[in-house]
């Protein structure tokens, strides 16, 4: 079940000073997710800039329907996708030496979900089946978070699927499911 991007409101989150975030990995092939980009600003070096607005990640608002098997929410729900430039990265020469490219260095930062909210959603089912409910876990806010290798990727495990996590009525699932189950958990999910 694809995202229905009716909205694309971006809110910038400013992390604590002294943190040096890096851009989040791109969410795979989601053409409907109009990410807010860097706004055409020139690249900066993390230890050279004094502008804290450079260290921001954005909360993009997206609207989608919650599905659970054959059932679908009567109304779409709106939630956040954490995206955007979490902060500048060092500008390093690439391996070939032609031009320059972005490569993270120093502390590892990600624009990730900060808080979640659970929402009970009414689902309508086809063929005369009684309406159902599902509890859905939705991203409520984002933040730039410094990750260490000791996080063992747990912070990122659901990065990209959390946003796609659905459903109270089916309440959120603690863990992301496989792609197929994810349909049921996007359709079903959590």
């Amino acid at each position: 079940q694809g995202w229905q991007a009716f909205k694309n409101d971006a809110t910038e989150i400013i992390p604590e000073l002294g943190e040096y975030p890096e851009p989040p990995p791109e969410l795979e092939n989601n053409k409907t997710m109009n990410r807010a980009e860097n706004g055409g600003r020139p690249p900066h070096h993390p230890f050279e800039t004094k502008d804290v607005s450079e260290y921001s990640c954005r909360e993009l608002h997206f609207t989608r329907y919650v599905t659970d098997g054959p059932c679908r929410s009567a109304k779409p729900v709106t939630e956040l996708v954490c995206s955007g430039q979490c902060g500048p990265a060092r500008l390093l020469p690439n391996a070939i030496g032609r031009g320059k490219w972005w490569r993270p260095s120093g502390p590892d930062f990600r624009c990730i979900p900060d808080r979640y909210r659970a929402q009970r959603v009414q689902l309508l089912c086809p063929g005369g089946e009684a309406p159902r409910a599902r509890k859905v876990r939705l991203v409520a806010s984002c933040k730039c978070k410094r990750l260490t290798r000791f996080h063992n990727q747990s912070e990122l495990k659901d990065f990209g699927t959390e946003a796609a996590r659905p459903q109270k009525g089916r309440k959120p699932r603690p863990r992301a499911r496989s792609a197929k189950a994810n349909q049921a958990e996007l359709e079903n999910a959590y």
Epitope: D68, G69, P70, Y116, A118, R120, C125, G127, E129, A130, R132, A133, R134, K135, V136, R137, Q167, K168, G169, R170, K171, P172, R173, P174, A184, N188, A189, Y190
Partner: antibody, heavy 119, light 107 residues
Framework: EVQLVQSGAEVKKPGASVKVSCKAS????????MHWVRQAPGQGLEWIGR????????IYDPKFQGRVTMTTDTSTSTAYMELRSLRSDDTAVYYC????????????WGQGTLVTVSS | DIQMTQSPSSLSASVGDRVTITCKAS??????VAWYQQKPGKAPKLLIY???TRHTGVPSRFSGSGSGTDFTLTISSLQPEDFATYYC?????????FGGGTKVEIK
């Protein structure tokens, strides 16, 4: 890691009450519906009821209505099921389970608590 | 209440066999059926939900089908670890109800 850890085995006399606990970790119980299911020795599974920890809303199987009370303590992420006026045929393993759906299947289960009712 | 009648109650099979278990609902439950596997002394494990959707990590040899009142769980090629008891459950409406179980034993 998502876990449901239940309290230990109990032996009760007929007419007594038992309260079984189920402590959740790795997730927020308010985001799910907590169910209780029992299984008598050598028998099948029997649904008792469910509670929404977020608001205390409860649905019981009518056959247990009046004898069972389900509660949750969200501060400790623990669900409780109390069964009163115990009879010998209440001897069973009691499981807690949860899911986000209402009604639901059960994605995760506790390890079970054996309640033996014997005089 | 919706009754779920499972058959057979037990069956004997060999490793590599194709095994089919059926579940019949007393009224239309659409596709709101789940299947579980349970081994002695253990809690049930979810295999299938929405009649045919495999739960995460469940081997592809397990498949479910059906809608309305008739449902089937199929194990395409029985493995040693599949000897267990299997239950169907309807979640179309409360109270939730389970089938009586099918015990799959080694022939």
């Amino acid at each position: 890691e998502v876990q449901l850890v239940q309290s230990g085995a109990e032996v009760k006399k007929p007419g007594a009450s038992v309260k079984v606990s189920c402590k959740a970790s790795g997730f927020n119980i308010k985001d799910y519906y907590m169910h209780w299911v029992r299984q008598a020795p050598g028998q099948g599974l029997e649904w008792i009821g469910r509670i929404d920890p977020e608001n205390g809303d409860i649905i019981y199987d009518p056959k247990f209505q009046g004898r069972v009370t389900m509660t949750t303590d969200t501060s400790t992420s623990t669900a409780y099921m109390e069964l009163r006026s115990l009879r010998s045929d209440d001897t069973a393993v009691y499981y807690c389970a949860y899911d986000a759906g209402d009604p639901a299947w059960f994605t995760y289960w506790g390890q079970g608590t054996l309640v033996t009712v014997s005089s | 209440d919706i009754q779920m009648t499972q058959s057979p109650s037990s069956l004997s099979a060999s490793v590599g066999d194709r095994v089919t278990i059926t579940c019949k609902a007393s009224q239309d439950v659409f596709t709101a059926v789940a299947w579980y596997q349970q081994k002695p002394g253990k809690a049930p494990k979810l295999l299938i939900y929405w009649a045919s959707t495999r739960h995460t990590g469940v081997p592809s040899r397990f498949s479910g089908s059906g809608s309305g009142t008739d449902f089937t769980l199929t194990i395409s090629s029985l493995q040693p670890e599949d000897f267990a008891t299997y239950y169907c459950q309807q979640y179309s409406s409360y109270p939730l109800t389970f089938g009586g179980g099918t015990k799959v034993e080694i022939k």
